[in-house]
């Protein structure tokens, strides 16, 4: 099966790599603009230069293109705990990330929030914290994992998942409650 090509891709595929079809004259192939620049005017004819201009401050193009406008630089989202790793340049968008000992949680493809890596108190580190994944903890006996923290089995209610892990403790508590003095 032939993949469906959009109009722009169809137009571009007729020209050799690094060139695009002139929008008003499909017999002319114009040279694309370098990254960091955008298309100001199409080339007037074959073998003639495309008029490319450098992106203005606050905008960029990261690859060769024939865009009429540069793309706006992304802003790091302070409300999500993001920090700027590297600032925007004419040929590269802003790079946002998290502080040391934090990881990224992606709520959607293009939205992440920074959270502190778990320290595994009352447990051991099974897998260290990574850029996009929290620490994986293994809890000590008498503790169970809840929201990636090791919580005492004394906080385990019968209705919760922790009952299997905390079964001996729950039985002990139940036994203590049941054994009344006569």
């Amino acid at each position: 099966l032939v993949p469906h090509l959009g109009d722009r891709e169809k137009r571009d595929s007729v020209c050799p790599q690094g060139k695009y079809i002139h929008p008003q004259n499909n017999s002319i192939c114009c040279t694309k603009c370098h990254k960091g620049t955008y298309l100001y005017n199409d080339c007037p004819g074959p073998g003639q230069d495309t008029d490319c201009r450098e992106c203005e401050s606050g905008s960029f193009t990261a690859s060769e293109n024939h865009l009429r406008h540069c793309l706006s630089c992304s802003k790091c989202r302070k409300e999500m705990g993001q920090v700027e790793i590297s600032s925007c340049t004419v040929d590269r968008d802003t790079v946002c990330g998290c502080r040391k000992n934090q990881y990224r949680h992606y709520w959607s493809e293009n939205l992440f929030q920074c959270f502190n890596c778990s320290l595994c108190l009352n447990g051991t580190v099974h897998l260290s914290c990574q850029e996009k994944q929290n620490t994986v903890c293994t809890c000590h006996a008498g503790f169970f994992l809840r929201e990636n923290e090791c919580v005492s089995c004394s906080n385990c209610k019968k209705s919760l998942e922790c009952t299997k892990l905390c079964l001996p403790q729950i039985e002990n508590v139940k036994g203590t409650e049941d054994s009344g003095t006569t």
């Epitope: 409300e79 929030q113 959270f115 929201e147 990636n148």
Partner: nanobody, 119 residues
Amino acid sequence: EVQLLESGGGLIQPGGSLRLSCAASGFTFAHETMVWVRQAPGKGLEWVSHIDRVGQDTYYADPVKGRFTISRDNSRNTLYLQMNSLRSEDTAVYYCAVLPKRGPWFDYRGQGTLVTVSS
């Protein structure tokens, strides 16, 4: 006790508009970034939009960009979601929530309001 109470949902025809509200109490509303998430039938929770404490910075997920507007009134402790040009794929239960701080789960989320977009 933190309470979040959504309202404004209902049955609406494609192309129509709705305004959802979320009344907040039990915490300092003006200190928190607020979020709208939704859950379509048989699907997981989807981030829709959020707004920072002062209402300056907003975010919209791609499927709702240009159609939905999030706002807040800190004097009334209320969060809003204006939904225009509604589509059948917007059918979901809409929840308002406080932006999580400790980890990727919602400690404080409302009971939700159902939005059904159908002709």
